[in-house]
Amino acid sequence: IWSAVFLNSLFNQEVQIPLTESYCGPCPKNWICYKNNCYQFFDESKNWYESQASCMSQNASLLKVYSKEDQDLLKLVKSYHWMGLVHIPTNGSWQWEDGSILSPNLLTIIEMQKGDCALYASSFKGYIENCSTPNTYICMQRTV
Amino acid sequence: IWSAVFLNSLFNQEVQIPLTESYCGPCPKNWICYKNNCYQFFDESKNWYESQASCMSQNASLLKVYSKEDQDLLKLVKSYHWMGLVHIPTNGSWQWEDGSILSPNLLTIIEMQKGDCALYASSFKGYIENCSTPNTYICMQRTV
């Protein structure tokens, strides 16, 4: 975050930006920036693998839910979107693309369907779905 | 927007931020920044007037929908929230807090209810509601 005060003094600007205001990012152009994470919702339906590839091509990953507080904007997301959560049948755990295990109390897993991938739904719910089913998806990029 | 390239050269940083990446804002701390507008969703239910006062106290206004393209993140908003749209009974028009008239084709107005205020709902819908009914609300701040 570039403190507005710092930027003001640096460039000796006249414009007064309140102390409580700050810049967010950096993010890819036209992505959503929130609490220094970048998010983008993609309208086109792809299977989980294609969605993952699409995010990777943009130097991002599929959505990872790591904090209800830092990601509370996700509460209000309408519809269902691929996130980066996959089921590991060998040990029965759910893990993120980066290999970390899903922590308890972050997501409610809802098993209506056979499948090893999960769709994000509002209020921190994850719906199990067949990985080859086309769905919209959310990419995420953590800022440095 | 502070170009990442500009910031890099300014501070002679090693970290390579792609040309396509940029900063968003400035916004109040922990607000959502998208296409250089700032948004915040408030959980507590207030009537329209209280919601307006809450936004004003944060140097913002209730949500104004001015562009489906620049505000396409609103497509995916779940639930119903006060926005800054009010009905002017004298001429039958709908106008924003800043006095501008609602442009055609921006919102679908749905009259379920008698009222002079409107709730924003996903996919650019506006539900007419009694202004004294408590609801959650969206504040918005346009960046300079």
């Epitope: 269902y80 997501l107 897993i109 209506m112 | -």
Partner: antibody, heavy 131, light 106 residues
């Protein structure tokens, strides 16, 4: 004994709204989603939607989207289905049904919900729409 | 939207085996549930998740699911099995029922 008891038969005029209740007993209301299913005379079953009583989240069938509102009142252990802008084709029996069970300690200590079918049904409520 | 196809009617001789099919594109990748409904009564779940029986449902009821067809099998059919039978799946965030099959026990 697990029971779902629905409100009585209704006769409504076209354009009106009907609200049916489904009072549960014999289990913890918030541990199962509640579904509503329509059955027109001589026809098959049609799923209308569901509610998670824990947080009020709903999912509606596309056919009924915009006309149906499903709610749950945890203070009275009652689910409701409201159908608006009634037309003659809405003449049917409406069932509430329990399904999707909460398992607080699923694999890896995660909170899980499993769908094992709609295992308990209400007795049905007949709604007649006629002018 | 996803479609489930059931035969309108199936007949079986008393004591014989009845098979009711439910067709759907790649249905084997989905969980299939079966319901029995007798005239004037609410439906009853008889099979869940392809092949599991709820408590109280006789062993004569069994289910299978692979490829494009799910099957409900009722062995040693009894007069009391005469009813409408519906299959059900979850697809695209909606529950879908088949059109129903009327089972007649001769």
């Amino acid at each position: 004994e697990v029971q779902l008891v629905q409100s009585g038969a209704e006769v409504k005029k076209p354009g009106a709204t009907v609200k049916i209740s489904c009072k549960v007993s014999g289990y913890t209301f918030t541990d199962y989603y509640m579904h509503w299913v329509q059955q027109a005379p001589g026809k098959g079953l049609e799923w209308m939607g569901l509610v998670d009583p824990e947080d009020g989240e709903t999912i509606y069938a596309e056919k009924f989207q915009g006309r149906v509102t499903i709610t749950a009142d945890t203070s009275t252990d009652t689910a409701y289905m409201e159908l608006s802008s009634l037309r003659s084709e809405d003449t049917a029996v409406y069932y509430c049904a329990r399904g999707i069970a909460r398992y607080p300690n699923g694999p890896g200590g995660l909170l899980y919900y499993y769908y094992y079918g709609m295992d308990v049904w209400g007795q049905g409520t007949t709604v007649t729409v006629s002018s | 939207s996803y479609e489930l196809t059931q035969p309108l009617s199936v007949s079986v001789a008393l004591g014989q085996t009845a098979r009711i099919t439910c067709g759907g594109n790649n249905i084997g990748s989905k969980n299939v549930h079966w319901y029995q409904q007798k005239p004037g009564q609410a439906p009853v779940l008889v099979i869940y998740r392809d092949s599991n029986r709820p408590s109280g449902i006789p062993e004569r009821f069994s289910g299978s699911n692979s490829g494009n067809t799910a099957t409900l099998t009722i062995s040693r059919a009894q007069a009391g099995d005469e009813a409408d039978y519906y299959c059900q799946v979850w697809d695209s965030f909606a529950f879908v029922f088949g059109g129903g099959t009327k089972l007649t026990v001769l």
